[in-house]
């Protein structure tokens, strides 16, 4: 009867997210493997998080629009093992808007889910940021290595959208 | 106030490339923005057909991407457009513009435009 | 890519009528969208950007709409100076397409 009635809730919610989402890909997790982690397909999962990558070329503002209208944010990359993850699934000769900015040129970086933005764990490419003309961030391969790189934001580019997982 | 003016030959062969190149004065084409290559067909229809950003990377249409190549000469403030293989269909005005004012929201700067004709 | 459908390919009007001209988005291009004005043997001039803001020194008898995959030109007391060709552009994800142009001309 426990068991019913959660998987009548988990079928409730699943018919609620199926508006947002057609398709979810659900993993178990949880100490008694109860709990459903979900994530819209065809996006990847890493730890409590959904990724996207958007090949799509648009403007800073339209990356962040895009992914707002998809329910999520420009990435935010809070670790290396974040960024080594989102990594692994972008093209090395792509660039790609993070939702890191500078709005008024002033070096004060903020990100877009107001996570406050810590010097030390950043990950720009030797040199960079480099210029308060360039008031948004991608992450590009360069020297060998994935890092950031302070861009004009009008210039279209690729970009990589994060929301939280959905748990059914 | 930043102009751009387009210049190549106005008739080129069938087979042959095409090129033009668009010179940029009243601002640096490597300080911002992208730098457009855009046709007009005869029937006035218009396409773009790909560009450079302020710091070199390029951009092509799907449909031209195979004969397509966009560069610059930072010195003399120019970029250029080079099409490759060229038939009838290529004939048409080309416009160099530039990309990204209003956040980009429209193309505000264009140069007067060249005819080119292919022709036999 | 995103296609621009724009109609009336002609238009005939006179001086001091309104006229509109309507842009169709074969997706949500979510406001990103630009009019110009072309005269013969001339380039695209910019008009209106992100849907309906007005470049500066745009007359106001000249106002854009719309939203989602809906936008139109509407041009108000026509003059002698606005006959010619008029284009839409989406800017919502590169390529960016134009409609296929609307031909003003005088009545």
């Known amino acids: 009867n426990f068991m019913y009635s959660k998987t009548v809730k988990r079928l409730s919610k699943l018919q609620e997210y199926q508006q947002y989402y057609p398709s979810l890909t659900c993993v178990m997790e949880g100490k008694d493997m109860e709990d459903w982690s979900c994530c819209p397909t065809p996006w990847t999962s890493f730890q409590s998080s959904c990724y996207f990558i958007s090949t799509v070329m648009q403007s800073w503002t339209k990356s962040q629009n895009n992914c707002s209208v998809m329910g999520a944010d420009l990435v935010v990359i809070n670790t290396k093992e974040e960024q080594d993850f989102i990594t692994q699934n972008l093209k090395i000769n792509s660039a790609y808007f993070l939702g890191l900015s500078d709005p008024k040129g002033w070096r004060h970086w903020q990100w877009v889910d107001q996570t406050p933005y810590n010097k030390n764990v950043t990950f720009w490419h030797s040199g960079e940021p480099n210029s308060p003309d360039e008031r948004c961030a991608i992450i590009n391969f360069r020297s060998e290595e994935w890092g950031w790189n302070d861009v004009h934001c009008h210039v279209p580019q690729k970009s990589i959208c994060k929301m939280k997982k959905i748990y059914i | 106030d930043v102009q751009l003016q387009e210049s190549g030959p106005g008739l080129v062969k069938p087979s042959q490339s095409l090129s033009l190149t668009c010179s940029v004065t009243g601002y640096s084409i490597t300080s911002a923005y992208y730098w457009n290559w855009i046709r007009q067909f005869p029937g006035n229809k218009l396409e773009c057909m790909g560009y450079i950003t302020y710091d070199g990377n390029n951009y092509y249409s799907p449909s031209l991407k195979n004969r397509i190549s966009i560069t610059r000469d930072t010195s003399k403030n120019q970029f250029f457009l080079n099409l490759n293989s060229v038939t009838t269909e290529d004939t048409a005005t080309y416009f160099c513009a530039r990309g990204g004012d209003y956040d980009d929201g429209g193309f505000a700067f264009w140069g007067q435009g060249t005819l080119v004709t292919v022709s036999a | 890519d995103i296609q621009m459908t724009q109609s009336p390919a002609s238009l005939s009007a006179s001086v001091g009528e309104t006229v509109t001209i309507t842009c169709r988005a074969s997706g949500n291009i979510h406001n990103y969208l630009a009019w110009y004005h072309q005269k013969q043997g001339k380039s695209p001039q910019l008009l209106v950007y992100?849907?309906?803001s007005l470049v500066d020194g745009v007359p106001s008898r000249f106002s854009g709409s719309g939203s989602g995959t809906q936008y139109s030109l509407r041009i108000n007391s026509l003059q002698p100076e606005d006959f010619g060709s008029y284009y839409c552009?989406?800017?919502?994800?590169?390529?960016?397409?134009f409609g296929g142009g609307t031909k003003l001309e005088i009545i």
């Open positions: 992100n849907a309906k």
């Open positions: 552009q989406h800017f919502w994800i590169v390529p960016y397409t």
